[in-house]
């Protein structure tokens, strides 16, 4: 349901000092400037709602312009504990400590936070991305090495009067950016502690956070150009659905991906795209300025609402799911990658989705809000949308219950 009740303290409608505090691009992540230590060391930090560690490069690495030098900080405290974080591809490892942290274009506060000083990594830092660390904004349950390591945002809320809420406006450029353009460009805003009404149009619609680990939500229906995919809604959330600013694509479970691609192919069948395009391998290009946006369908995800049997839908355009990519070989054209891909870990609503919307992570009320972003890329015929309410029954059945693996649940 829309949030029209009087605003709580700390939720004033203008956060001028935080607007435009993000830079970057969807393919390589959005980052905020942070300072660590005393005297302050400035670093660019990837904003990641899909993890829960604050981790920064703390040793030389070929892809890092700078790194956190603990020995130069008088306020660094060693926790004498290591941390190892493996991914499906790649990993990082480091040493845990605490230090004073602040966000120059954020709330005017300094907090003592846990920091993982990354000493070794593989396939983690991205060449040319311009960020040196990661700010995991999700919950303690998925923090490494375990849930006793308090995430940054928890420390911030505990130690200050900052309300337990943040909001993100990620602004996709709609065209490829070279390195110098990225450095000069505005990537969006992370509003810490509130909601800035200038960053969205229309109403905010909220979906419950199903469980506080990732920012897990429940998708109850999917439409391609208004056509229902007609799948058992459990499939949409198998094995979970999360909102993740650290992921580029909209990632969908295998069955859902296959059905969605089939439907998008059918809707855009006036042109024959190579199989490699749907896999994300081949680019498709058009003469500059002639991209036929109209042949591609809109995609709607219906999310569980705050009221029983009520849902709302968020609708993205091809301008969000076709990601502009610069290639010197075809520089005379506008070229794009298909930014929807297959997942084996559930639905991931990455930058492709988030670039269409202003997204409110209302941790205090265990809900996530969506409104049409004031900076989303669209054309004169269609715009991204957040609409409701819709009547949807048995939405609880759409959630997938991940089997527990601890011994207490195993049959003997």
């Amino acid at each position: 349901e829309t949030d029209e009740e009087p605003e709580e303290p700390g939720r004033r409608g203008s956060f001028v000092e935080m607007v435009d505090n993000l830079r970057g691009k969807s393919g390589q992540g959005y980052y905020v400037e942070m300072t660590v230590g005393s005297p302050p060391q400035t670093l660019n930090i990837l904003v990641d709602t899909g993890s829960s560690n604050f981790a920064v490069g703390a040793a030389p690495h070929p892809f890092l312009h700078r790194y956190y030098q603990r020995q130069l900080s008088s306020t660094y405290r060693d926790l004498r504990k290591g941390v190892y974080v493996p991914y499906t591809q790649g990993k990082w490892e480091g040493e845990l400590g605490t230090d004073l942290v602040s966000i120059p274009h954020g709330p005017n506060v300094t907090v003592r936070a846990n920091i993982a000083a990354i000493t070794e990594s593989d396939k983690f830092f991205i060449n040319g991305s311009n960020w040196e660390g990661i700010l995991g904004l999700a919950y303690a349950e998925i923090a490494r090495p375990d849930d006793s390591l308090e995430p940054f945002f928890d420390s911030l809320v505990k130690q200050t009067h900052v309300p337990n809420l943040f909001s993100l406006q990620l602004c996709g450029a709609g065209f490829p950016l070279n390195q110098s353009e990225v450095l000069a460009s505005v990537g969006g805003s992370m509003i810490i502690g509130g909601i800035d009404h200038s960053l969205y149009t229309g109403s905010l619609w909220y979906t419950p956070i199903r469980r506080e680990w990732y920012y897990e939500v429940i998708i109850v229906r999917v439409e391609i150009n208004g056509q229902d995919l007609k799948m058992d809604c459990k499939e949409y959330n198998y094995d979970k659905s999360i909102v993740d600013s650290g992921t580029t694509n909209l990632r969908l479970p295998k069955k859902v991906f296959e059905a969605a691609v089939k439907s998008i192919k059918a809707a855009s069948s006036t042109e024959k795209f190579p199989d490699g395009f749907w896999l994300g391998e081949q680019l498709v290009c058009w003469q500059a300025g002639t991209t036929p946006w109209n042949i591609f369908p809109v995609i709607s995800l219906y999310l569980m609402g705050e009221v029983t049997n009520q849902s709302f839908r968020i609708t993205i355009l091809p301008q969000q799911y076709l990601r502009p990519v610069e290639d010197v070989a075809t520089s005379q054209d506008d070229c794009y990658k298909f930014a929807i891909s297959q997942s084996s870990t559930g639905t991931v609503m990455g930058a492709v989705i988030m670039e269409g919307f202003y997204v409110v992570f209302d941790r205090a009320r265990k809900r996530i809000g969506f409104a049409v972003s004031a900076c989303h890329v669209h054309d004169e015929f269609r715009t991204a949308a957040v609409e409701g309410p819709f009547v949807t029954l048995d939405m609880e059945d759409c959630g997938y219950n991940i089997p527990q693996t601890d011994e207490s649940t195993l049959m003997t």
């Epitope: 591809q89 042109e271 190579p274 490699g276 391998e281 081949q282 290009c285 070989a329 075809t330 070229c335």
Partner: antibody, heavy 116, light 107 residues
Framework: EVQLQQSGPELVKPGASVKLSCKAS?????NFWIHWLKQRPGQGLEW???????????KYNQKFKAKATLTVDTSSSTTYMHLSSLTSEDSAVYYC?????????WGQRTLVTVSA | DIVMTQSQKFMSTSVGDRVSVTCKAS??????VAWYQQKSGQSPKALIY???HRYSGVPDRFTGSGSGTDFTLTISNVQSEDLAEYFC?????????FGGGTKLEIK
């Protein structure tokens, strides 16, 4: 300038294996897939397979599935192709190529000779 | 697999002439066809993508045409440096496949 630098020529014995490398530069490595191709005189060009450097996802030509293994090291922007159980049929020129639309960029070639 | 057939293995032409190299796909590949030039002892060089688009830096004497199953690479005002073998490729579906090549000889 986009460049794909391939490793040097290899002379290997039948039954042995070999690992070829392709080092990319001049672009964002994780943005584009890398392909490997084989060329034998009079047999044209054959596509072996491809790898996505962003997540190491691979796809192979069925014909080469038991022969070739593709891997990637993003820290050095290098892709590798391991060829196993080599026979005289594997003597050929091998290329890596970068995707985009089709294969806009090619490595400079690696000659593999299988001989006792 | 899609078979790409270049029926002419060799073509002879003179400097300044116009020559057309043809390629036939065994099934509809839309416009998902590329053309490459390979000089002796060198790697292939990309000329044309999407059947008719020139890659950056390719001289405009090279033009591509066709869709579906029949494709043509035309070189107008042939130059001596165009002495090479020309390959077509379909990238419509996996596995990607190439034509057998057409060697251009300059008289």
């Amino acid at each position: 300038e986009v460049q794909l630098q391939q490793s040097g020529p290899e002379l290997v014995k039948p039954g042995a294996s070999v690992k070829l490398s392709c080092k990319a530069s001049g672009y964002t490595f994780t943005n584009f897939w890398i392909h490997w191709l084989k060329q034998r005189p009079g047999q044209g060009l054959e596509w072996i397979g491809m790898i996505d450097p962003s997540d190491s996802y691979t796809k192979y030509n069925q014909k080469f599935k038991a022969k070739a293994t593709l891997t990637v090291d993003t820290s050095s922007s290098t892709t590798y192709m391991h060829l196993s159980s080599l026979t005289s049929e594997d003597s050929a020129v091998y290329y890596c190529a970068r995707s985009g639309v089709a294969f806009p960029y090619w490595g400079q070639r690696t000659l593999v000779t299988v001989s006792a | 697999d899609i078979v790409m057939t270049q029926s002419q293995k060799f073509m002879s032409t003179s400097v300044g002439d116009r020559v057309s190299v043809t390629c036939k796909a065994s099934q509809n590949v839309g416009t998902n066809v590329a053309w490459y030039q390979q000089k002796s002892g060198q790697s292939p060089k990309a000329l044309i993508y999407s059947a008719s688009h020139r890659y950056s830096g390719v001289p405009d004497r090279f033009t591509g045409s066709g869709s579906g199953t029949d494709f043509t690479l035309t070189i107008s005002n042939v130059q001596s440096e165009d002495l090479a073998e020309y390959f077509c490729q379909q990238y419509n579906s996996y596995p990607y496949t190439f034509g057998g090549g057409t060697k251009l000889e300059i008289k």
